[in-house]
């Protein structure tokens, strides 16, 4: 197979014909050294998936349900290109499956039993698979056949295409369950009409259905969406209140050696030459031979799926949960309102050891999952492999953009017993230099810098945000002569000062000796000119408070703070000499797990929190000999957030704005994936 050939998989004679036409037309417009198309014909999409996994083909376009099949082992395929709909300016690659109700009704998602339901059709994504998959474990047993369980759950339904003879209750609201537009309650508009007419109490449709059927806002205001957290929201708020986000139609390829760049190059060129309204001879998004061949006729173009986005992230936790429930038919033995153990995400093996000790002491109420970077941990929480972790504000921002929510804040200054209910203002991000140096905020260019990690608040977002507004470019590695900013590109000058050891050099975890607050300060002590840390770092690591060899003889007076006005002050004066106030670190979780995480952590800190005095012979949650493992070591308690329960409210408008500005310079693959 030529290196630059993309073997497209076709699933019918008509698709194969269109594929050959696609191949011939691409050949006529692309240079001979450019990508080319070859066509492979298989009997079904599942056969195509297997062929790609076996390296007999390279690409095929799939609906969401099949993307799930493609992702499962042993196929292990991943999404590489998405079709988009709507305009180029506002491309839609996903739709949202929603549960619509009338505003004057008074039930929530967990009170659907005994209601009347309207569905788009049996086996369809938004109308059946997603809602029934998510409700699966609430259905009465036996859950097979599924239609019978659903009929016994709702008091009456309209499920077009269901068998009205075997399951009459599923056709109670639309006699015969007609499987075409002859049934007035068929498909999206029909299911909504079923609700509108008062036949049903809830309609399972997609977010756009309401807008397509009710042009008038006043009419739309008579309806609401049911959210998975048992609240309701207006129909405009579908992004924050849906059953699942569903990718529309996606090109998949192998996860390893999948030619994703070549596939993108090919499709990008294809849409330039043969996209909507581009060519008379050949059209990518239509065909005289039939409907939706190779690509959906309604597609307007393609978008490259960010490389960090695997199938789990692309399909989303809710969608995967729904489909897995339906396919595997397994439900937890424990009642769903009971909290299962919380899986904490630990960074690398140092945190994992502490987490393991916590797990033993919690009698298994805490379990541990590991990842090598904070972003990998956030991704694991998103997809359900882990449940929670405590994060610096910069990562609270990324986690928030990825749909996670803050649950509890670390408090550093409030003594018990008021600690748990106190909202602290935050800590100070400071720039520390040696007293012997002549550095000021205004002459840092060309100096050696030490950072906690890329993307963290005191070590990166605040100082680099301030720097960006001064230099107006993102080439921070050119501003400093060298430095250590764990998480930077390995060949960057901002990895030059890092200490490793070797395979872990510049990694954003505790295996890198200069990672985190203590690490950045150590970098200053041993190699650097300036360290960007929290205001407590110098006092916590001087005067014998840190027993490690490099720190045990350090004196606080040998270090000073840089003030933004060009002056310098003692490390005892951070309130009058800091770069900005930083939001405290906070525990994050998925929305569905937030309450359990909060309840469990409040219970755990009563046993293992700062009330434990002897940490040499007892487990202490907030202690790791200055290494800030799992939590900052100076945490007094984890505090309730009250109404600051979204990342925007928790971080505050000013900080969110600063980080949003710095996104121009973002090196976060996860953030790119989450904002796709």
């Amino acid at each position: 197979v030529p290196e630059k050939s993309v073997r497209w998989c076709a699933v019918s004679e008509h698709e194969a014909t269109k594929c050959q036409s696609f191949r011939d037309h691409m050949k006529s417009v692309l240079p001979s050294n450019g990508p080319s198309v070859a066509c492979v014909k298989k009997a079904s999409h599942l056969d195509c998936i297997r062929a790609i996994a076996a390296n007999e083909a390279d690409a095929v376009t799939l609906d969401a349900g099949l993307v799930y099949d493609a992702y499962l082992a042993p196929n292990n395929l991943k999404p590489v290109v998405a079709e988009f709909y709507g305009s180029k300016e506002d491309p839609q690659t996903f739709y949202y499956a929603v549960a619509v109700v009338k505003k004057d009704s008074d039930f929530q998602m967990n009170q659907l039993r005994g209601r009347k339901s309207c569905h788009t059709g049996l086996g369809r994504s938004a109308g059946w698979n997603i809602p029934i998959g998510l409700l699966y474990c609430d259905l009465p047993e036996p859950r097979k056949p599924l239609e019978k369980a659903v009929a016994n759950f709702f008091s009456g339904s309209c499920v077009p295409c269901a068998d009205g003879t075997d399951f009459p209750q599923l056709c109670q609201l639309c006699p015969g369950c007609g499987c075409s537009t002859l049934n007035q309650y068929f498909s999206y508009s029909g299911a909504f009409k079923c609700l509108k007419d008062g036949a049903g109490d809830v309609a399972f449709v997609k977010h756009s259905t309401i807008f397509e059927n009710l042009a008038n806002k006043a009419d739309r205001d008579q309806y609401e969406l049911l959210c998975l957290d048992n609240t309701r929201k207006s129909v405009d708020e579908y992004k924050d209140c849906h059953l699942a986000r569903v990718p529309s139609h996606t090109v998949v390829a192998r996860s390893v050696g999948g030619k994703e760049d070549l596939i993108w190059e090919l499709l990008n060129q294809a849409q330039e030459h043969f996209g909507k309204d581009k060519s008379k001879e050949f059209q990518l998004f239509s065909s005289p031979h039939g409907k939706d061949l190779l690509f959906k006729d309604s597609a307007h173009g393609f978008l490259k799926v960010p490389p960090r986005m695997d199938a789990k992230m692309y399909l989303g936790y809710e969608y995967i949960t729904a489909i897995r429930n339906l396919r595997e038919g397994t439900c937890p033995e424990a009642p769903t309102d009971e909290c299962k153990p919380v899986k904490w995400c630990a960074l690398s093996h140092h945190e994992r050891l502490k987490c393991d000790e916590w797990s033993v002491n919690s009698a298994g109420k805490i379990e541990c999952e590991s990842a090598e970077t904070t972003e990998d941990c956030i991704a694991k929480i998103m997809n359900g492999e882990a449940d929670a972790m405590s994060l610096d504000g910069g990562f609270v921002y990324i986690a928030g953009m990825c749909g996670l929510v803050p649950v509890l804040a670390e408090n550093y200054n409030t003594p018990n017993p008021n600690c748990e209910n106190t909202a602290e203002e935050g800590y100070f991000a400071v720039a520390v230099v040696k007293s012997s140096s002549d550095l000021t905020w205004d002459n840092l260019k060309g100096k050696k810098s030490c950072h906690t990690a890329v993307g963290r608040t005191a070590g990166w977002n605040i100082p680099m945000g301030l720097l960006y507004s001064k230099i107006n470019h993102c080439r921070f590695d050119e501003f400093f002569s060298e430095g250590c900013a764990p998480g930077s590109e390995k060949n960057s000058s901002l990895c030059k000062l890092c200490m490793g050891p070797s395979p872990n050099l510049c990694e954003p975890n505790n295996k890198e000796g200069y990672y985190g607050y203590t690490g950045a300060f150590r970098c200053l002590v041993e190699k650097g000119d300036v360290a960007f840390v929290k205001h407590q770092t110098v006092p916590q690591n001087t005067g014998g408070k840190n027993p490690d060899a490099w720190a045990k003889n350090l004196k606080e007076e040998d270090y000073e703070l840089l003030c933004l006005d060009g002056s310098r002050k003692s490390v005892q004066e951070p309130a009058n000499c800091h770069l900005a106030r930083a939001p405290n670190h906070a525990v994050v979780a998925r929305k569905d797990k937030a309450d359990c995480v909060q309840t469990l952590l409040l219970d755990q800190q009563r046993m293992f929190g700062s009330s434990v005095t002897d940490c040499s012979s007892n487990f202490c949650l907030f202690e790791s000999k200055t290494k800030d493992l799992l939590f900052r070591d100076d945490t007094v308690c984890l505090a309730k957030l009250h109404d600051r329960n979204t990342y925007e409210k928790y971080l505050g408008e000013e900080y969110v704005k600063a980080v949003t500005n710095l996104r121009k310079c973002s090196t976060s693959p996860l953030l790119e994936a989450c904002t796709f």
């Epitope: 140092h350 945190e351 050891l353 502490k354 000790e357 033993v360 002491n361 009698a363 505790n510 040499s616 012979s617 007892n618 487990f619 790791s624 000999k625 290494k627 493992l629």
Partner: nanobody, 117 residues
Framework: EVQLVECGGGLVQPGGSLRLSCAAS????????MAWYRQAPGQQRELVAG???????NYADSVKGRFTISRDNAKNTLYLQMNSLKPEDTAVYYC???????????WGQGTQVTVSS
């Protein structure tokens, strides 16, 4: 600082039993948490079982109901009773007491357990 030495490993058939011991060079009475870990070739070291000073225990899902951890403070020894052994239990088994903190990468020699017919 207490030194720990593991022993009791060996070759055993599937379904068989072994009892591992971990002898401490000093008193373990004041040590809060002790644990057994294992590492199979090419795998990460994983927690098998742990026990607190108060006797609270915790097990990895894969060994629940088959392995039992216990400690004898008078003898300064930690034990792991392993029953119904499976080929996937094959690994080097280590004990730890977390007293060196989480940062020192200190592990003893461990004891090899091989489950094979």
């Amino acid at each position: 600082e207490v030194q720990l030495v593991e022993c009791g490993g060996g070759l055993v058939q599937p379904g068989g039993s072994l009892r591992l011991s971990c002898a401490a060079s000093g008193s373990i009475a004041s040590i809060n948490t002790m644990a057994w870990y294992r590492q199979a070739p090419g795998q990460q070291r994983e927690l098998v079982a742990g026990i607190t000073r108060g006797g609270s225990t915790n097990y990895a899902d894969s060994v629940k109901g088959r392995f039992t951890i216990s400690r004898d403070n008078a003898k300064n020894t930690l034990y792991l009773q392993m029953n119904s052994l499976k080929p996937e239990d094959t690994a080097v088994y280590y004990c730890t007491d977390y007293s060196r903190g989480y940062y020192q990468d200190y592990w003893g020699q461990g004891t090899q357990v091989t489950v094979s017919s």
